[in-house]
Amino acid sequence: RGVFRRDAHKSEVAHRFKDLGEENFKALVLIAFAQYLQQCPFEDHVKLVNEVTEFAKTCVADESAENCDKSLHTLFGDKLCTVATLRETYGEMADCCAKQEPERNECFLQHKDDNPNLPRLVRPEVDVMCTAFHDNEETFLKKYLYEIARRHPYFYAPELLFFAKRYKAAFTECCQAADKAACLLPKLDELRDEGKASSAKQRLKCASLQKFGERAFKAWAVARLSQRFPKAEFAEVSKLVTDLTKVHTECCHGDLLECADDRADLAKYICENQDSISSKLKECCEKPLLEKSHCIAEVENDEMPADLPSLAADFVESKDVCKNYAEAKDVFLGMFLYEYARRHPDYSVVLLLRLAKTYETTLEKCCAAADPHECYAKVFDEFKPLVEEPQNLIKQNCELFEQLGEYKFQNALLVRYTKKVPQVSTPTLVEVSRNLGKVGSKCCKHPEAKRMPCAEDYLSVVLNQLCVLHEKTPVSDRVTKCCTESLVNRRPCFSALEVDETYVPKEFNAETFTFHADICTLSEKERQIKKQTALVELVKHKPKATKEQLKAVMDDFAAFVEKCCKADDKETCFAEEGKKLVAASQAALGL
């Protein structure tokens, strides 16, 4: 039983307009259109949104008016298919318009581009931004929604409304401040970093639903909500899981108005039933809608009930295990996952799911055996290596991180992953390895009890980025295998990869290692990316290079950049010293 209204409405568009209000309706339609047609100019999208909004108002006035009974996908799809340059701009995506709903919508969804060919967003001067904000606040905020949505086509739409609200608040406050830049820039940096993290987390949810289905998503949700709400009954957790699955299915399916509406209903339900869910929700539930939903999604785990009995009684020692399992497999496994997760906030969600899978596999085998109880009696012993593997990995990598610091830890991962999957494009390897390396600063500071859920669940998000980027242009069977075989075993699969011995080293190209004076004006982050790009290319040329060899070359490279950036004639320095560096590096690596 879900919390959502099931009553039919004569006009779906009128229903959603009334539920959400004009401001949210327009914002969500803009997000939807920008996520579908990622290359279209801002002005074209605004025009389409205004047309849809005017139409929605006619339906609010009279639900029986012409076309008001059409589904939202029909209305929105018809509108998108009026875009004149569809074939020239989007190629085969234009073929979607020949299909009928709901195939047309799913066709659009399948053409969403995780890595669209769009220019990097360059932040203008603070005064320029403040002037634009004051001149036309509405257009300024719409532009923000548009630019984020087109670059992040799976961004969780109701959460993007929350980001836009914070974006507006930052400008409202800081454009009046004495030192606008000091006030605004840290806030914008925080929004950018949080936004990227939010986008990546949602991308994993959508990938889970797309590639592994509803059951996989529900299992993830049972584990996570049971950790977060350990005092809640199984029936309550199950209900929340059903409703949360509906919300994310809608957003991932492009049903953004329904998704935002249902997310608001779910937040309302949670706050009305706090007493049976969690003691940590009080502050969240006092906030306005967008803040409330965000707060609930991020709320800390409640304390575990004091006297939880041993799990073994119901799931190993009981003579009814196979009977209970046979009667309702998914429910019984769901109860196992709930009971295990609420007792283990110290485990990652993916580990809990591996344990549940092991338990399921054991029951499938043992319940068909001559003596089932004897067969599954030691099932919990099988969990030990599964628990120890991520524990040991996190311990080793946190030690390495503490020894090296973030930048050099990222470099170690760059080398490690380039050797595992050298066919993957250099920009993807740099982006993914940099993000993998951020696990150190993010998680290693935590005490033991919080390290694993922080680290391994974060790594699942980052490896999903690799998977979706690789799916667009598949180049490595090993990546495809790790990405598609099992959602919960992606990280162990990548961890287990050794150096790819079949890889034929890339031909040496001096141009790849030619640098210019423009590197001197880059930010520290951009300069790091340049150096890390060179490091990946080095490994692709010489996959058998030792750590020591690579370190020597990278140290020489850093010194070269530092020297030439201090030189009077920088460009000449880069040209002359660069040639020497390339020759020395070739000699050092035996290229």
Epitope: P102, Q110, Q210, G213, E214, T249
Partner: nanobody, 125 residues
Framework: EVQLVESGGGLVQPGGSLRLSCAAS????????MGWFRQAPGKEREFVSA????????YYADSVKGRFTISRDNSKNTLYLQMNSLRAEDTAVYYC??????????????????WGQGTLVTVSS
């Protein structure tokens, strides 16, 4: 492994009705989504309708909405498609399909792992 066997196809006049059945054997559990697709000669296979085994939620192609009804009988492990007000353009081979994971895109044939052999529906006067 899941086996799907369709029945109920045949020749019918425009405006007439037919009821297709699809018997599923093997391990169909509550996570399944079952669907009907059709393929007319020389055309691509197209989505007709789908139903979630777990909650009974239904999905229809616009071209059949209001004329076709999908349903299932859990006790018999059988899927049905009641087709009313049939038209000449409904002529096709109708396939029953199962997606054991209920993946997000329910109109995409590649997301269905198991297929029946098909049953021919001809609408002609």
């Amino acid at each position: 492994e899941v086996q799907l066997v369709e029945s109920g196809g045949g020749l019918v006049q425009p405006g007439g009705s037919l009821r297709l059945s699809c018997a599923a054997s093997g391990s169909t559990d509550s996570a399944y989504r079952m669907g009907w697709f059709r393929q007319a000669p020389g055309k691509e296979r197209e989505f007709v309708s789908a139903i979630n085994w777990s909650d009974g939620r239904t999905y229809y192609a616009d071209s059949v909405k209001g004329r076709f009804t999908i349903s299932r009988d859990n006790s018999k492990n059988t899927l049905y498609l009641q087709m009313n007000s049939l038209r000449a353009e409904d002529t096709a081979v109708y396939y029953c399909a199962a997606d054991p994971d209920s993946r997000l895109y329910y109109t995409v044939p590649q997301n269905y792992d198991y297929w029946g052999q098909g049953t021919l529906v001809t609408v002609s006067s």
